[in-house]
Interface confidence: low
């Protein structure tokens, strides 16, 4: 299962499979997730250790039993890989680290006006993996505003140093935000030259391409098919790079296939998993387990559920079968790829789906109407759960926000449907940033069912919550994925980093905004909130947020949208934008429906609708 809790002041002892430098525990966790054998990690922040060599150390670990002994270490952070965590699996890392210099090979330097511009340059450079930016207050004047683009053999910094007035970060290519664009073509009977960065065995060129896409230094590849003339090179996938970023030469060669990494694609990256099953093929590797199951699909599911399993072979040999069940060989290797691929067998083989980010519907466990006043523009993929609820009568207009909480479910405010209960008039847009990008050809979701809380009454503030079941399930991408729900009975006191997003008015008498806005707002206790709203009852099923001095708030058009808070590296849906006195007025906080108080209702409705739980809140 998916385990996302972090252990503070704890270090896992033993089980090391790799180590590197990372700027924080979340990035370390991501590297663990994508490492073929890593199940656990431990991270040492600069403050936790005097040994300069071990500062920012990220230690990736494996364990046969799925656990390792934890020892107390002040400041250390440990946790689990996010393999099997569905939509939480992402190689995208947007954070900027202030006061930190991430070292590597500096291959390009230029003057820029901001760290965001530096990150953009890195994202738009084919070889850049991470960067450092010297701010205007850097102690050496000649280095001020320098943007250094960097790479390293492993894609992570070769060292990380604490350095004032320096800011560092990673390329956003894994966020599908590169402007470079990508080559989707696969070139038959063509071999690329240049430097091999790795060699793995794959059953076809498509798996080879996906591995190349997620390898830190692979820019293009050549695959030797299973009929290649040299037997020892059959099914070999060579991952390649070059100084220029493109192959310096290519040679026509029978039974070879070449292509490019898709990391520079804009808006869509391939999933970091391989779902195809290969009949008549055996995958060799270290035996993890053998089990009797009915059918190759169950074998793949069994492999996916056993977190250490990387690939499998389902044998149909008579001696491997009993009644309707046959042997399912669960296997693994050092690099996550088979150590041998044999053809013409009575088996079928494939890979674990543990890194698929569509995942199960129920993967969201503890990881990771009212325009926003005083907010700033959001960027692509920053709030991938935000949806726009629009009504198409004669014209089409944005009316409310909402939050994607499952493949087929959106959570919003009940009052959005006051006077507009007909589901046919609604269009739901997901994975968008600018409302102006919506044209008649933009895909949208239609509503199958609107479920308004049974105790909601029009023009009252209580139970302002509604579920929308979409007619068709949505696929998850970097720009369209669900928000985790809180635990039932969560106390909001743990949340200190909360944001409200929406396209609503930027002032009380304003208009709908084009670019999705975001604003960081602190939560306010219910007692404080009640003092500000003496004519209304602030119940325990509401949560309030706002600044005493006002100036930042949700407003008309934000209703139904999310109030999300980040805790332990994970975003959770704490509130649904509901009501308030005006917008951003002094001492008049915004009032939000408290999602934790409605967890039973949400789970009941999403289960009873089709008999299967569609999302799961943290344990």
């Amino acid at each position: 299962g998916c385990l996302t809790q972090l252990y503070e002041n704890a270090f896992f002892r033993g089980g090391d499979v790799a180590s590197m430098y990372t700027p924080n525990a979340q990035y370390c966790q991501m590297r663990c997730t994508f490492h073929p054998r890593c199940l656990l990690f431990s991270f040492l922040p600069a403050s936790s250790i005097n040994d300069m060599e071990k500062r920012f150390g990220c230690f990736l670990k494996d364990s046969v039993t799925g656990t390792l002994p934890k020892v107390h270490r002040t400041g250390a952070v440990s946790g689990h890989s996010l393999k099997q965590c569905g939509h939480q699996i992402s190689a995208c890392h947007r954070d900027i680290y202030k006061g930190v210099d991430m070292r590597g090979v500096n291959f390009n330097v230029s003057k820029v006006s901001s760290v965001e511009e530096c990150q953009k340059r890195c994202t738009s450079n084919i070889r850049c993996q991470f960067f450092s930016y010297a701010t205007q207050t850097f102690h050496k004047a000649e280095y001020r505003n320098n943007c250094l683009l960097k790479y390293s053999p492993g894609g992570t910094p070769t060292a990380i140093k604490v350095l004032s007035n320096v800011e560092s970060g990673f390329s956003l290519k894994p966020c599908a935000l590169s402007e470079i664009g990508c080559h989707m073509n696969i070139f038959q009977h063509l071999a690329f030259s240049d430097v091999d960065v790795a060699r793995v065995l794959t059953p076809d060129a498509f798996v080879c391409r996906t591995i190349c896409t997620y390898h830190p230094n692979c820019l293009f590849f050549t695959f030797y098919t299973n009929v290649w003339k040299i037997e020892s090179q059959r099914n070999v996938c060579l991952l390649k790079t070059s100084e220029s970023g493109t192959p310096s030469s290519s040679t026509p060669q029978e039974n070879t296939i070449s292509g490019y990494s898709l990391l520079t694609c804009k808006r869509t990256l391939p999933e970091p998993c391989h779902s195809k099953i290969y009949p008549g093929v055996d995958f060799g590797g270290e035996e993890l387990n053998v089990t009797f199951v009915k059918g190759v699909n169950v074998c793949q599911e069994t492999c996916t559920k056993m977190i250490r399993c990387q690939f499998f072979t389902y044998s149909l040999l008579p001696e491997d079968c009993k009644e309707e069940k046959c042997k399912c060989f669960l296997r693994l290797s050092m690099d996550g790829s088979p150590t041998r691929i044999a053809y013409g067998t009575q088996g079928s083989s494939g890979y674990s789906l543990r890194l698929c980010n569509t995942g199960d519907n129920s993967v969201c466990t503890t990881k990771t109407s009212t325009r926003i006043v005083g907010g700033t523009n959001s960027s692509w993929g920053e709030w991938p759960w935000q949806v726009s609820l629009q009504v198409k009568l004669t014209a089409q207009r944005h009316l409310c926000g909402g939050s994607l909480i499952g493949h087929q479910w959106v959570l919003t405010a009940a009052h959005c449907f006051d006077g507009l209960p007909l589901q046919d008039v609604w269009r739901i847009y997901s994975g968008i940033l600018n409302l102006s990008d919506i044209t008649k050809d933009t895909p949208f979701s239609q509503i199958k069912e609107i479920i308004i809380h049974q105790n909601y009454k029009v023009s009252e503030g209580n139970h302002d919550i509604a579920l929308i079941k979409l007619q068709a399930p949505l696929n998850y991408t970097e720009f369209q994925k669900p928000i985790c729900l809180p635990s039932k009975g969560d106390t909001s006191t743990i949340y200190t980093n909360c944001w409200v997003t929406g396209w609503g008015f930027s002032k009380e008498k304003g208009e709908i905004q084009n670019i999705l806005q975001k604003v960081n707002i602190p939560l306010v206790t219910n007692e404080e909130c009640q003092k500000r709203y003496q004519d209304y009852k602030i119940t325990q099923r509401m949560v309030c947020a706002g600044y005493k001095e006002g100036g930042k708030d949700a407003c008309k058009g934000d209703s139904g949208g999310p109030l999300v808070c980040k805790h332990n590296g994970m975003w959770r849906l704490v509130g649904i934008t509901s009501w308030g006195e005006g917008c951003a007025r002094r001492e008049q906080p915004g009032v939000y429906t408290k999602v934790a108080e409605y967890m039973d209702w949400i789970l009941e409705k999403t289960q009873s609708s089709d008999g299967k739980a569609q999302m799961q809140s943290p344990a």
Partner: antibody, heavy 117, light 107 residues
Amino acid sequence: QVQLVQSGAEVKKPGASVKVSCKASGYTFTDYEMHWVRQAPGLGLEWMGAIHPGSGGTAYNQKFKGRVTMTRDTSTSTVYMELSSLRSEDTAVYYCARPYGYPFAYWGQGTLVTVSS
Amino acid sequence: DIQMTQSPSSLSASVGERVTITCKASEDIYNRLAWYQQKPGKAPKLLLYGETGLEAGFHLRFSGSGSGTHYTLTISSLQPEDFATYYCQQYWSTPWTFGQGTKVEIK
């Protein structure tokens, strides 16, 4: 094939220590954790802890913390479990067990430790 | 620690009978459950584990089911060689813990 061969039966006095060995063969010794499980006469099974022979890392059941020590000798592919301050209720068969996936697929033949004055 | 409660503690059954043993965990163990068979004077033998894993060497008449905190082991048609003590064990959270055992005797 995987084999776990344990040392012979021991009789100890209360307050003494016992050290049981478990010699592994048929697989890469440093790749898999070795666990210890005990079974008192007529009673159920009780997990005592584990050692990762590759790293030397250990995990102990809190119940035995301070009394149990697990070590390994990679040159002979042997793990050891030492239990100190023995009392009569420590009379049990002690098993070493190796996981396959997660549960214990391979077990030693067991070592009977009798604590008696 | 997670407590594992097995029931019944013993049962008598005839060859060919269907037998069910239950195991209740004190908290959710997310299907991280193994079943072992032990015969007198011998080490336990892994029988079933996880959601689908039937250990090689055991017949398909053994099956496991359950989720959350409730799990069952079923022997569809008891054979003479099945008379033994059966233990459940959780491997969700250390310390790993076992049920107290169910002794299956010949009626």
